[in-house]
Interface confidence: low
């Protein structure tokens, strides 16, 4: 008799999820000497233990603590780049500017980037058919809780000047409901963080507006200022040129506005 299975609104676990996590872990620890001590089988076991046999709408940050412990990593606290709704450019930037780090440049962020996963209550099966959607089903699902947990820890670790890349093409350049707006902003530590510097990335070729005056940026400035952290904002008018100039700052075209 086929067993009834809960149908969720979101896509199911990424195919070959266990193999992918294990392979990514091995690759990461090979590339990053400071993480060579990490036992990737233990990492996978801890990852699996966070959601297998648990109801996928009842996951807690506590479930991920064994994984967090195994994935503990020190990144330079003054070289952190946060991002919201502009992941690709943020990652392209840190690939060039190797001394700055996004969450996905850390082991735990790298393991889970772009993946989906969930299990089922009381069975050891991974659900490849569907997983809970944050809006339509529940917010305490395995993926959302994972990112909330690692994002909180990443923000808590930041110090000095923290940078955030924001998408100037969106109607809400700063979105209070994004991971950045709902988690990271509120977990920056005022006793360690002097300034949050926002880089607003323009989309249009001829867009010369000052998006730092956008109402949502003013809202972000207000939230940050109330937390006793200074706020600074810069327009990046030409993201293509921006990346090119990070790669090659001596290029003569990189001395004018970007």
């Amino acid at each position: 008799v086929p067993r009834w299975r809960q149908q969720w609104s979101g896509p199911g676990t990424t195919k070959r999820f266990p193999e992918t996590v294990l392979a990514r872990c091995v690759k990461y620890t090979e590339i990053h000497p400071e993480m060579r001590h990490v036992d990737c089988q233990s990492v996978w076991d801890a990852f699996k233990g966070a959601f297998i046999s648990k109801h996928p709408c009842n996951i807690t940050e506590e479930d991920y603590q064994p994984l967090m412990k195994l994935g503990t990593q020190t990144v330079p606290c003054n070289k952190i780049l946060l991002w919201s709704r502009i992941k690709d450019l943020a990652h392209q930037f840190t690939q060039v500017q190797r001394d700055m780090f996004t969450l996905e440049d850390t082991l735990l962020g790298y393991l889970a980037d772009d993946l989906t996963w969930c299990g089922e209550f009381n069975t050891s099966k991974i659900n490849y058919q569907s997983c809970p959607d944050w809006r339509k089903d529940c917010s305490n699902n395995p993926v959302s809780v994972f990112w909330k947990t690692v994002s909180r820890r990443f923000a808590e670790a930041a110090c000095d000047v923290v940078h955030v890349m924001l998408n100037g093409s969106r109607s809400k350049i700063f979105d209070k409901n994004s991971t950045f707006g709902s988690v990271e902003v509120h977990n920056l530590q005022p006793e360690k963080v002097q300034t949050l510097e926002a880089w607003v990335i323009h989309g249009g070729r001829e867009d010369s507006r000052d998006l730092c005056q956008d109402p949502t940026i003013k809202e972000l400035e207000s939230i940050i200022s109330k937390r006793n952290i200074q706020f600074s904002c810069k327009n990046i008018y030409r993201p293509d040129k921006f990346l090119q100039c990070v790669k090659n700052p001596e290029d003569s075209s990189c001395t004018s506005e970007i």
Epitope: Q97, M100, Y237, V246, P249, I258
Partner: nanobody, 121 residues
Framework: QVQLQESGGGLVQAGGSLRLSCAIS???????MGWFRQAPGKEREFQAG????????YYADSVKGRFTISRDNTKNTLYLQMNSLKPEDTAIYYC???????????????WGQGTQVTVSS
């Protein structure tokens, strides 16, 4: 367009210290920056440079260990901390943005007006 405005120059005794500041205004830009000086009757010379992101610093041999360049991207300000000043450090000090090659004394896109530093013996 980018504007640069130096401040912090003045008269100081040999062995003393000064801190020069360079306020950067205008649109955001990516550029390496530096400090140059020009003594009377001499060419403008590179003193110190700094890269935009990594903050790597470069110095002329004559000021290594005495001068420190730094920048605060959030305040859009470049600094030059000058210690153990000597009479031969007397010059007009210029802030420059957009160094084509760090260390090249002429190649920069933007220049400040300069601030006078006089070191008396």
């Amino acid at each position: 367009q980018v504007q640069l405005q130096e401040s912090g120059g003045g008269l100081v005794q040999a062995g003393g210290s000064l801190r020069l500041s360079c306020a950067i205004s205008g649109r955001t830009f990516i550029a390496d920056m530096g400090w140059f000086r020009q003594a009377p009757g001499k060419e403008r010379e590179f003193q110190a440079g700094i890269t935009w992101f990594g903050g790597s610093t470069y110095y002329a041999d004559s000021v290594k260990g005495r001068f420190t360049i730094s920048r605060d991207n959030t305040k859009n300000t470049l600094y030059l901390q000058m210690n153990s000043l000597k009479p031969e450090d007397t010059a007009i000090y210029y802030c420059a943005a957009g160094l084509k090659r760090i260390g090249d004394q002429r190649e920069a896109d933007y220049w400040g007006q300069g601030t006078q530093v006089t070191v008396s013996s």
